[in-house]
């Protein structure tokens, strides 16, 4: 069947980098200028990508393969092929409709993206807080207060104020 | 496909506790909150309140601080809610839903089929 | 208490114009994003705007979002209105990036 159609369709023999032309009897021309056809037998060639703007060239177009673009520095990538750049943001800071904000109290961010997220819950594995969080880091678990030997002691951290509603540590 | 799929419908003793679960796939559960919220019959949508699956940290409205538990199982991909000492006001559809991690302040992208639970004597 | 207050119900014939408002009681309608979701009997919401003015894929060019700071309210505002419009809508923003607020919904009905 693959043969058969081969025979009665001759653009399927127009490699990737160029498309089937109808105007000139169906032969293979090379993509124009700033164009690309990644498969074979293809009847046109799409456009390529540019990168304008925030966005920054990580690879030039070529006739068989788009380009592909990153952010500039400051930004970072979004959703599949980098189709956004957001702003980065400095640790211990979220992104919002405002720019970057600190994170609430009870939580942290520990990278230039992201949003923040709560601090560890030590308790639900029976421990308790060793080192407390802050914006920018997790609080650090430590033995279970009965694993304690005697005179030892673990940092309690300080009740969350401003922030309702986040479980206690 | 991301899809978040819960547990079937309850019926409950005034309190009593429910524990409704929010099985998660097609994506890193670990890395996304999952929030609660309901809706009691006829009424509009409430905040219970959210988890970080990632490392089991949480946040409750205070309505519900003291009466609703979440935790989330990483190995099965799957947040729970426990609701205790019901009432009849609890009586609604609970949901779970995820946030993206792009903002703050962003939509909840992805909600599960909601769970009705009824308090009823 | 940061309160987000929508009329009960709306009501408009086929093929006009309808818009829900979104009122911020107190702060500022642009310090957080506004989302909105539909919501029709038996199902869970499905986002219709987000980010107050982005349509997700799927959603027909009808919809759309806007801010209104002057009224410290947000709209969602659907042309060319279809039967299938008819459901209860949400608006949804934040108090903090912890605690999301809820309007208390507007139910359309498409006449």
């Known amino acids: 069947f693959e043969r058969t159609r081969s025979l009665q369709d001759p653009c399927s023999n127009c490699p990737a980098g160029t498309f089937c032309d109808n105007n000139r009897n169906q032969i293979c021309s090379p993509c124009p200028p700033n164009s690309f056809s990644s498969a074979g037998g293809q009847r046109t060639c799409d456009i390529c990508r540019q990168c304008k703007g925030v966005f920054r060239t990580r690879k030039e177009c070529s006739s068989t393969s788009n380009a592909e673009c990153d952010c500039t520095p400051g930004f970072h990538c979004l959703g599949a092929g980098c189709s956004m750049c957001e702003q980065d943001c400095k640790q211990g800071q979220e992104l919002t409709k405002k720019g970057c904000k600190d994170c609430c109290f009870g939580t942290f961010n520990d990278q230039k993206r992201g949003i923040c997220r709560p601090w560890t819950n030590c308790s639900l594995d029976g421990k308790s807080v060793l080192v407390n969080g802050t914006k920018e880091r997790d609080v650090v678990c430590g033995p279970s207060p009965a694993d304690l030997s005697p005179g030892a002691s673990s940092v309690t951290p300080p009740a969350p104020a401003r922030e309702p509603g986040h479980s206690p540590q | 496909e991301v899809q978040l799929v819960q547990s079937g419908a309850e019926v409950k003793k005034p309190g009593s506790s429910v524990k409704v679960s929010c099985k998660a796939s097609?994506?890193?559960?670990?890395?996304?909150?999952i929030y609660w919220v309901r809706q009691a019959p006829g009424q509009g949508l409430e905040w219970i309140g959210n988890i970080w699956p990632g490392n089991g940290g949480t946040f409750y409205g205070e309505k519900f601080m003291g009466r609703a538990t979440f935790t989330a199982d990483t190995s099965t991909s799957t947040a729970y809610m426990e609701l205790s000492s019901l009432r009849s006001e609890d009586t609604a559809v609970y949901y779970c839903a995820r946030r993206p991690d792009y903002s703050g302040d962003d939509y909840f992208d992805y909600w599960g089929q909601g769970t009705l639970v009824t308090v009823s004597s | 208490n940061v309160m987000l207050t929508q009329p009960h119900s709306v009501s408009e014939s086929p093929g006009k114009t309808v818009t829900i408002s979104c009122k911020l009681n107190s702060g500022n309608i642009g310090s957080y994003y506004v989302h909105w979701y539909q919501q029709r009997p038996g199902s869970s919401p499905t986002t219709m705007i987000y980010?107050?003015?982005?349509?997700p894929d799927g959603v027909p060019d009808r919809f759309s979002g806007s801010i209104d700071s002057s009224s410290n309210s947000a709209s969602l505002t659907i042309s060319g209105l279809k039967t299938e419009d008819e459901a209860d809508y949400y608006c949804h923003s934040y108090d903090s990036t912890i605690t999301p607020v809820f309007g208390g919904g507007t139910k359309l009905t498409v006449l």
């Open positions: 097609g994506y890193t559960f670990t890395s996304y909150y």
């Open positions: 980010r107050d003015d982005k349509r």
